[in-house]
């Protein structure tokens, strides 16, 4: 009866694959798939290149790369030839107002006067109370503090120059970086007299100076990297070896390891249940109930009521029960998953080149991002610079009559203004002209291009690896039947025939991702809105799109495997992959979870191992090493440790992503193999003996008793 029901379920997801005597793994005779999408993608790329050229012709990224003073003049050029550095009167206002979008569009502009200087201030200084009544000449010019805006009279009172923001009220020891003066050294600034309430100036100065010892820190960081780069590379080498070792050793230890990990999870859940019970018991005896608490948005308050712990206990108990039932009733599926993991380990061992394919993907991704960044930058800086009237404090007396944000001439600064600190500052680039008017659309095109190309590169990587690993599975006699260069042939095959299919899959994913980005943007804009209904709807939308993206990624991944094997178009491949997986949904879930668990542990092992080794080495805790292995003397020993850990994580992720792709490909091939073949002489199984054994199947022996080599 159960069998009949299963047959019905299977038929709901299509008929099992029929035997095809001509099938010998990844099809050799292919034709181009999704040609329309391929043409569309190539045209889009062509357009993207045109946008890049237009941006390059019209753009002027000097605005972002070279510093400009408040009047919009470049430092180090023209009238400021001898003044190459930009000094911000109040650098902290930059920190408070800078974000990635404003930097991309307007460069490092911030709401504080900026002046070109011949050298950055070397000493910490602040205007003393007794200097307010002195002249600008006495306080600034004669003391070689030539940091006021151009044209401030020598005999002007300092206090009025400060109120008009013509001169800086404090100076921090700075060093030039990107042509700008950035503060350094751990200085204790003298108290800023009379301006304790002036948030724009006093805002976090002491705290920020402590944390912004930029030059001092950067020099020390540079020194540390100079002393430890060799050992960081060694640590990354260790990460590489550990990752490889873990994957290759899986064929030996996959079974016991999975068992230990599952038991570990069971143990953690059991401890969780015990802990929740203890907490619940204590609070129950105290009589701490949710009814006493009432409704509160303070989540930490819920820790002190018994119902919270009871709910947690129930959830953990249910999870524990599910896991135990899975272990008891799905042990056969778990054994298949383990056998597939071992098979994947063998496949990687046979085709070690696949392990380094993520480098190709990484380089291609880097090219896509760099191209987009440069295009966006050049686009943002196309057109004539525009200047507007701006004041740091528009609520000052006398500012109410001034039309802030109206256009002005930077060469004609508004000295005749009743508004303190009124200036003509650079705002952005004009939208006159075809390119400038289309700027927003071109930027959108660029973002679309970025997402589409990134997704296409990732799709290419998945399809290439799938092709390589499929050629391993469908090799009847391993390793003799495996092609000589499986990775290269898969790469060429994918590029030549399936660019369109990959573009189609990538486009679907791109549209969902862009919808998510738009939603995130709307959510960001609505942050201040306290309407719970709106927030709830937004949350639901975001959740749905997140799920949709996850599903499409899963579907695409399996569609690319099918494309790599059969060379069919995207839709057919996606349908076939989906129906095949749905016919074996329990196996899919078990394999997916077991693989996730194993790869998570693998990452933990690699990153943890490298982290521990780095910690003991760089902190000088390993004694008795030879002279050649002596740890360097460092200012911040955590720096190379963190670098090593992050590097190890990147390397492990790269390797395990290949392994994950390998498992998925072999799994799909295995399911195909089960449906396509029956173990007879003309329809033998391609799977390994261990998988056959688990399934209780075997291949018929040929008449001459020649057994096939596995």
């Amino acid at each position: 009866m159960g069998g009949k029901q299963r047959d019905k379920d299977d038929e709901a997801y299509g008929k099992p694959v029929k035997y095809d005597p001509s099938f010998r793994g990844p099809i050799k005779n292919r034709s181009c798939t999704d040609v329309i999408c391929c043409v569309l993608f190539l045209l889009f790329i062509l357009g993207y290149i045109v946008v890049g050229i237009v941006a390059w012709l019209y753009g002027d990224p000097r605005q972002v790369l070279y510093p400009r003073n408040s009047t919009g003049a470049y430092c180090g050029m023209g009238e400021n030839k001898d003044k190459p550095y930009l000094l911000y009167f109040n650098i902290f206002s930059c920190i408070l107002s800078t974000n990635i979008i404003s930097v991309a569009e307007n460069g490092l502009q911030c709401p504080t006067p900026q002046v070109c200087v011949s050298s950055c201030p070397e000493d910490p200084w602040t205007v003393g109370k007794n200097q307010f009544s002195q002249t600008v000449g006495e306080v600034f010019y004669t003391k070689n503090r030539n940091f006021c805006l151009p044209g401030v009279p020598w005999n002007m009172m300092v206090i009025t120059s400060l109120q008009q923001e013509l001169c800086p009220s404090f100076l921090l020891p700075s060093a030039p970086a990107l042509g700008r003066c950035f503060p350094w050294t751990n200085v204790t600034l003298p108290e800023l007299p009379g301006i304790t309430n002036d948030t724009t100036i006093a805002q976090g100065i002491s705290g920020l100076i402590d944390s912004l010892n930029a030059r001092d820190i950067s020099v020390k960081i540079f020194e540390d990297f100079a002393h430890s780069w060799y050992w960081i590379l060694v640590a990354l080498g260790v990460a590489l070896l550990l990752s490889l070792l873990f994957i290759l050793l899986l064929r030996l230890v996959a079974g016991p390891l999975v068992l230990v990990l599952i038991l570990g999870v069971l143990g953690v859940l059991a401890y969780g249940i015990y802990y929740c019970w203890e907490e619940y018991r204590v609070l129950r005896d105290k009589g701490a109930s949710i009814s006493q608490l009432g409704f509160t948005t303070n989540l930490s308050a819920y820790q002190s009521v018994q119902e919270t712990w009871l709910a947690a206990l129930i959830v953990l108990a249910v999870l524990e029960a599910i896991l135990l039932l899975v272990l008891i009733f799905l042990r056969q599926r778990i054994r298949i998953a383990i056998a597939l993991l071992k098979e994947a380990s063998k496949a990687v061992g046979q085709m070690m080149s696949t392990m380094f394919y993520p480098l190709v993907t990484f380089v291609l991704l880097l090219i896509c991002i760099a191209y987009w960044a440069m295009t966006a930058l050049y686009l943002a800086t196309s057109g004539q610079p525009q200047y507007v009237l701006w004041a740091s404090n528009i609520s000052s007396p006398g500012c109410e009559k001034v039309s802030i944000n109206t256009s002005c001439n930077p060469m004609d600064q508004p000295v005749n203004s009743s508004c303190p600190g009124l200036m003509c500052v650079f705002q952005g680039y004009s939208s006159k002209g075809l390119v400038q008017r289309s700027l927003f659309n071109l930027q959108i095109y660029g973002v679309l291009g970025l997402f589409w190309t990134l997704n296409w590169v990732l799709a290419l990587g998945q399809c290439v690896l799938a092709g390589a690993f499929a050629s391993f599975y469908w090799a009847f006699h391993k390793p003799q039947d495996i092609p000589t260069f499986p990775l290269i042939s898969a790469f060429i095959r994918t590029l030549r025939y399936h660019t369109g299919s990959l573009a189609f899959g990538a486009l679907i994913l791109t549209l969902v991702q862009i919808a998510r980005v738009i939603l995130e943007y709307i959510d960001h804009k609505l942050r201040g809105v306290q309407n719970p209904v709106a927030r709830c709807i937004m949350c639901c939308f975001k959740c749905c799109l997140w799920c949709l993206e996850k599903f499409i990624k899963f579907l695409n991944r399996n569609a690319y495997i099918m494309i790599a094997i059969y060379g069919k178009n995207f839709c057919v491949s996606a349908k076939n992959a989906f129906t095949l997986l749905m016919r074996n949904i329990v196996r899919v879930v078990v394999l997916d979870k077991v693989t996730d668990l194993l790869l998570f542990f693998g990452k933990l092992l690699v990153v943890g191992g490298v982290g521990v080794l780095s910690f003991f080495f760089f902190s000088g805790r390993i004694q008795g090493l030879g002279r050649d292995f002596k740890s360097p003397h460092l200012n911040y020993y955590w720096l190379p440790i963190m670098t090593s850990i992050m590097g190890a994580y990147v390397i492990a992720s790269g390797f395990f992503s290949v392994f994950g792709m390998c498992v998925d490909t072999l799994f799909l091939c295995f399911l195909e193999d089960l449906e396509r073949n029956d173990g007879s002489l003309d329809r033998p199984y391609y799977m390994s003996k261990s998988l056959l054994k688990i399934l209780g199947k075997k291949n018929e022996a040929p008449p001459d008793n020649k057994k096939r080599k596995k």
Epitope: K129, N130, F132, S133, Q134, T135, P153, N155, M156, M157, I159, T160, L162, Q163, Q164, P193, G194, I195, D198, P397, G398, V415, N416, S417, S418, P420
Partner: antibody, heavy 125, light 107 residues
Framework: QVQLVESGGGVVQPGRSLRLSCAAS????????MHWVRQAPGKGLEWVAV????????YYADSVKGRFTISRDNSKNTLYLQMNSLRAEDTAVYYC??????????????????WGQGTTVTVSS | DIQMTQSPSSLSASVGDRVTITCRAS??????LAWFQQKPGKAPKSLIY???SLQSGVPSKFSGSGSGTDFTLTITSLQPEDFATYYC?????????FGPGTKVDIK
């Protein structure tokens, strides 16, 4: 209430010296800058000198630079103007005036707000 | 040094009239300008500071405006006690300087 009273004026021969005083009351003298302003007979006001609250910063009009010295004694709440090498054109009513800026209010600078009644100086041979 | 000029140098007006006096600085002084009123034989009295802010105790019929180099003092409804000489003064650049004054007398 805030009050400034000038004294020390009189008739003096050219080339001689004179010292004017200004007694302040009703406010914290040591927190404010103080000015001397003069007015020649039938003419407009002419700013002479300023001394800031602690006496460290002093500034003068070009016409009196090098000849006049402004000083203050915060313990006595008194402002002084030492006038040397007097000339006929120095003949005027001399007013002392308080500067509204107390040295604490960074945000705005107001200029002079309270004036004395003046003392007359006549330079004549 | 900054030169301050006032116009007119004198004007005759009747009680209830609206009077406007202008003051010009030889270079930009932002809003660091004060207006003083002086009656014959008396000490000057501060009316306006910061070009437009009224000193405490000064009636609202006095108002000031302007910035940079051009400033005005307006008396909306002239009263007998308002007949006096009015001076403007800049106080941002040393030496501080006064305008020559504008004498307002009864027509």
């Amino acid at each position: 209430q805030v009050q400034l009273v000038e004294s020390g004026g009189g008739v003096v021969q050219p080339g001689r010296s004179l010292r004017l005083s200004c007694a302040a009351s009703g406010f914290t003298f040591s927190s404010h800058g103080m000015h001397w302003v003069r007015q020649a007979p039938g003419k407009g006001l002419e700013w002479v000198a300023v001394i800031w609250y602690d006496g460290s910063n002093k500034y003068y009009a070009d016409s009196v630079k090098g000849r006049f010295t402004i000083s203050r004694d915060n313990s006595k709440n008194t402002l002084y103007l030492q006038m040397n090498s007097l000339r006929a054109e120095d003949t005027a009513v001399y007013y002392c005036a308080r500067d509204a800026y107390s040295g604490y209010d960074y945000y705005y600078y107001y200029g002079m707000d309270v004036w004395g009644q003046g003392t007359t100086v006549t330079v004549s041979s | 040094d900054i030169q301050m000029t006032q116009s007119p140098s004198s004007l005759s007006a009747s009680v209830g009239d609206r009077v406007t006096i202008t003051c010009r600085a030889s270079q930009g002084i932002y809003t660091y300008l004060a207006w003083f009123q002086q009656k014959p034989g008396k000490a000057p009295k501060s009316l306006i500071y910061g070009a437009s802010s009224l000193q405490s105790g000064v009636p609202s019929k006095f108002s000031g405006s302007g910035s940079g180099t051009d400033f005005t003092l307006t008396i909306t409804s002239l009263q007998p006690e308002d007949f006096a000489t009015y001076y403007c003064q800049q106080y941002t650049i040393y030496p501080f300087s006064f305008g020559p004054g504008t004498k307002v007398d009864i027509k």
